[in-house]
């Protein structure tokens, strides 16, 4: 079988060679070939070349479309880890440390406080805040965690909020709040997490984190 295949290949190769040689002879205007024959062979050859070029163009287009699609919709995702802060601010601090995610420069962590996006679209935004508090040591007000948004030219606004009453456990009882939702973000929009008492937030591995994902 293999031998027959080889003979077939050689025969095809010989035919191709004869065909190319004939085109060459047509081009040099050899008298032994009729004009009609030459025209037929030339148009056949032009057809082959056209097909090859069209195929090349199509492949090029497909590839460039794939690239464009990839460029237009790159994965945008971030997951950052809580960072203890000496600042008295109620806005939680985050860091790119541990098992964090920062997909590309289309999302950035700015001033350690906010995740800022460069592209408009729908994003799933989430935060988990673990805190340790005691009823006696804390004020009457509950512990509140807020997921907030600041868009260019607009006031800060609360997107999501959750409240937990303080524990009676001593010295303090651990509790976790999880916030998550889908929101339309504009280019340059920043999201951040605000809490009533940042000193009660737990910064142990996996307890407090914040992130987003473009849908």
């Amino acid at each position: 079988h293999r031998r027959l295949d080889k003979i077939e290949d050689e025969r095809n190769l010989h035919e191709d060679f004869v065909f190319m040689k004939t085109i060459q002879r047509c081009n040099t205007g050899e008298r032994s070939l009729s004009l009609l024959n030459c025209e037929e062979i030339k148009s056949q050859f032009e057809g082959f070349v056209k097909d090859i070029m069209l195929n090349k163009e199509e492949t090029k287009k497909e590839n460039s479309f794939e690239m464009q699609k990839g460029d237009q919709n790159p994965q945008i995702a971030a997951h950052v880890i809580s960072e203890a802060s000496s600042k008295t601010t109620s806005v939680l601090q985050w860091a790119e440390k541990g098992y964090y995610t920062m997909s590309n420069n289309l999302v950035t962590l700015e001033n350690g406080k906010q995740l800022t996006v460069k592209r408009q679209g729908l994003y799933y935004i989430y935060a988990q805040v673990t805190f340790c508090s005691n009823r006696e040591a804390s004020s009457q007000a509950p512990f509140i965690a807020s997921l907030c948004l600041k868009s260019p030219g607009r006031f800060e606004r609360i997107l999501l909020r959750a409240a937990n009453t303080h524990s009676s456990a001593k010295p303090c009882g651990q509790q976790s709040i999880h916030l998550g939702g889908v929101f339309e973000l504009q280019p340059g929009a920043s999201v951040f997490v605000n809490v009533t008492d940042p000193s009660q937030v737990s910064h142990g591995t996996g307890f407090t984190s914040f992130g987003l994902l473009k849908l």
Epitope: V91, K113, G153, F155, R157
Partner: nanobody, 129 residues
């Protein structure tokens, strides 16, 4: 209530600099969005710059971008406006404004006068040679 008092205005030559201050008293505006507006003679009051209450994010009018800087002190009781490369068209009375975070309105744009709850009396800035 919150009282806002501006200071630092005066006469300055074109290309010069000036720093305005706005002191807040009363219910200290720990969670207030603060802004500067200005009103030139015979013109409407216009937005200059704003700073957000929690993040301290800033927004500027196109006419002052790159020349003016809004900031506040750590206690959030004093607001500043650093004005550089001043031009004659910057001549106006400059007002400090504050908005409570609980303020409810149909618009959330920082450059709209109606979105602010408290106003100072203003300080005059004259840019002339």
């Amino acid at each position: 209530d919150v009282q806002l008092v501006e200071s630092g205005g005066g006469l300055v030559q074109p290309g010069g600099s000036l720093r305005l201050s706005c002191a807040a008293s009363g219910r200290t505006p720990l969670n207030y969005h603060m802004a500067w507006f200005r009103q030139a003679p015979g013109k409407e009051r216009e937005f200059v710059a704003a700073i957000s209450s929690l993040l301290g994010s800033t927004d500027y009018a196109d006419s002052v971008k790159g020349r003016f800087t809004i900031s506040r002190d750590n206690s959030k009781t004093t607001l500043y406006l650093q004005m550089n490369s001043l031009r004659p068209e910057d001549t106006a009375v400059y007002y400090c404004a504050a908005r409570e975070t609980t303020h409810i309105s149909t618009s959330d744009r920082v450059n709209e006068i109606r979105n602010y709850d408290y106003w100072g009396q203003g300080t005059l800035v004259t840019v002339s040679s």
